[in-house]
Amino acid sequence: TGGQGPMPRVKYHAGDGHRALSFFQQKGLRDFDTLLLSDDGNTLYVGAREAVLALNIQNPGIPRLKNMIPWPASERKKTECAFKKKSNETQCFNFIRVLVSYNATHLYACGTFAFSPACTFIELQDSLLLPILIDKVMDGKGQSPFDPVHKHTAVLVDGMLYSGTMNNFLGSEPILMRTLGSQPVLKTDIFLRWLHADASFVAAIPSTQVVYFFFEETASEFDFFEELYISRVAQVCKNDVGGEKLLQKKWTTFLKAQLLCAQPGQLPFNIIRHAVLLPADSPSVSRIYAVFTSQWQVGGTRSSAVCAFSLTDIERVFKGKYKELNKETSRWTTYRGSEVSPRPGSCSMGPSSDKALTFMKDHFLMDEHVVGTPLLVKSGVEYTRLAVESARGLDGSSHVVMYLGTSTGSLHKAVVPQDSSAYLVEEIQLSPDSEPVRNLQLAPAQGAVFAGFSGGIWRVPRANCSVYESCVDCVLARDPHCAWDPESRLCSLLSGSTKPWKQDMERGNPEWVCTRGPMARSPRRQSPPQLIKEVLTVPNSILELPCPHLSALASYHWSHGRAKISEASATVYNGSLLLLPQDGVGGLYQCVATENGYSYPVVSYWVDSQDQPLALDPELAGVPRERVQVPLTRVGGGASMAAQRSYWPH
């Protein structure tokens, strides 16, 4: 992996037809920011600028618009917004920021509403959206941000909306709030400084008794020579009802702790960008996967990391010691006093005494931090969003698969082997304009990931098995969704009956898997070609033998017969071999890839001259052959001949 982090094995450029993708866009619509999957997995609800859409995603291909309802900010609010020096072109609109499934018949949506947040219930009829009635629009302060650029998060739990956003026009008043449902509305307290003014929320994840909020903010507990940002997890109890007078309508169970995502001895990745929960059969082993960047640009480039945090570790830190602020010195130190009962954040049902509440309001910062396991560290890339799922390999083993959206509009598919660092199966450049990925939504039933952009939504099938044309390539890819079917001789998506299929997730070693098994024949260092391309030399012309680089992880060399052609040789240019017809030029040329300790011919050419045909090596007698034309350059200047087949670069 080197200092750069793992390289994607395969890279698809924007518009590359080898990666099956489809793009939904709608004339006049922009900012497809908020994505919600219906319970049955067949409809994708989308919050865009001034509109909510229902897309049918049941069938492969481009999502089909079921219907769309407009929800523009009122003219009065737009006028007020412009009067307050905000832009009519980019800001004074209703950007949908919250879209959750409230019950079987209603969605709940909130938007910026031209810097005057608003929320509404949207009725569903057979998964179609019914129009929004103006008199049903409510104040959305504390649920949606005012400014579309402000980060925010919201999650609906037991009919209550837990939201983290900016609560004022200036964007200097962060708030964690609970609304809807029968419980009292609760929020964070301004004066108690539970949140720094620049707190930026990225995720809200419910657990058994609590809801966790993930955010970043300026750190107040460290003396640092520059402003230091820090990532946090906060918790509030679902059964919190606020205080009777002290902390009335305020959280009485708010606690926060530092999240640490760092490689040993390195500066931490201190800015959290997104987090998701991957549930496990037992909640205690469930893990939260989070994407981080760093405020420090090492070597002038942005870098990102994905860390995993166990719920058990988070719970343990919240059960540990507190920090407290010494107001005389403005220093945070470990609290060493006696415990109060009930303990802050313990979610005990009884009413809290004023003494306990007084303690709570000042003891909200935990002493220990939650340490994450770095799974992927990559420089030169800024991850913005992630989606995570578990995939079962052929052998029944479970693999964590992460889909990572970047700030330049690409999607990385990463696989985390058990107790090991992640590797990148592929990188897909979705946006031709390098626009950032705004949101990701996994649709497991459809076997796809949906990526929201400013201009539309990409549907990305979770795997692209058919691109691996040989057993070797299929196995080396180590994509848990793909395996080699020896019968059809295709790399295919894993499905029900796959007994004789081939896959090696642990080692990615085709040496055993792609032969008939370990007992069949002694392992060979290099596999034989699957196809030989026959090429005729043309007098006074340079032959160009292309070599498709199927994997960025392989090293490539050319061989002639049994001899390796030196890399320094001027005959290799951009991976292609250039041949000038002369005596001894004929015979077998192979472009050989070496990956994961295994060598295999990517392409094999038999070069023949019209006047001196060569007898084919008897060892290659059973290998199928195909006559091809390759690009030629006439010596002394002349046009290149187009190849009959294109050799696409990854």
Epitope: F191, S220, K245, L246, K249, K327, E328, S330, T358
Partner: antibody, heavy 121, light 111 residues
């Protein structure tokens, strides 16, 4: 002892800018909110906003957002209230006050003596 | 927006007891703490009661505060009135957005 010392009276013309100050002493200035309160001639007290000098986190009352700027310089234990373009209606006495810890919550426990600002053409 | 209403003026003779009320416009006044400030003519305000009924040190025990949930109002009571008590008195609480709100003030005249 704990005290807040405010800058002296100002006479200004409409359209001019102004920055008045409030210097804290006798306590850890960075650990307490400082609020600003307006009192127009013969009228009551109006809450303008607050600042936490430790990190300059400022919050404004609804009527004053966008009208004034509250800032602080923690290195010299001073909070400021600033106008970019004064109006005649800004004529008032401006008090700074510390938001102190009660047993349970906050109240304005220490007040400055006030700065009289007169805006007249 | 949340408002606190006080009587514009009250007057009483020295040695007597006076009560100044402060009522909230919406919701229960008891749900938030109420503080009271005294402002003598030409001076800055000072705190006489905080958190409904707490007295800062140095404030005589003639000053007391209370909350009456039935009338949804807070009260400042001054017993044994002295001429030096002549001042404007302001109640203060917080609205739903944690903004401080002052009552309009009550002018106390000691006859």
């Amino acid at each position: 002892q704990v005290q807040l010392v405010q800058s002296g009276a100002e006479v200004k013309k409409p359209g001019e800018s102004l920055k008045i100050s409030c210097k804290g002493s006798g306590y850890s200035f960075t650990s307490y909110w400082v609020g600003w309160v307006r009192q127009m001639p013969g009228k009551g007290l109006e809450w303008m906003g607050i600042i936490y000098p430790g990190d300059s986190d400022a919050r404004y009352g609804p009527s004053f957002q966008g009208q004034v700027t509250i800032s602080a310089d923690k290195s010299i234990n001073t909070a400021y209230l600033q106008w970019n373009s004064l109006k005649a209606s800004d004529t008032a006495t401006y008090y700074c006050a510390r938001l102190g810890d009660g047993a349970y919550y906050y109240y304005l426990d220490v007040w400055g003596r006030g700065t009289m600002v007169t805006v007249s053409s | 927006s949340y408002e606190l209403t006080q009587p514009p003026s009250v007057s009483e003779s020295p040695g007597r007891t006076v009560t100044i009320s402060c009522s909230g416009s919406s919701g229960s006044i008891a749900s938030n703490f109420v503080h009271w400030y005294q402002q003598r003519p030409g001076s800055a305000p000072t705190t006489v009661i905080y958190e409904d009924d707490q007295r800062p040190s140095g404030v005589p025990d003639r000053f007391s505060g209370s909350i009456d949930s039935s009338s949804n109002s807070a009260s400042l009571t001054i017993s044994g009135l002295k001429t030096e008590d002549e001042a404007d008195y302001y109640c203060q609480s917080y609205d739903n957005n944690d903004h401080a709100v002052f009552g309009g003030g009550t002018k106390l005249t000691v006859l």
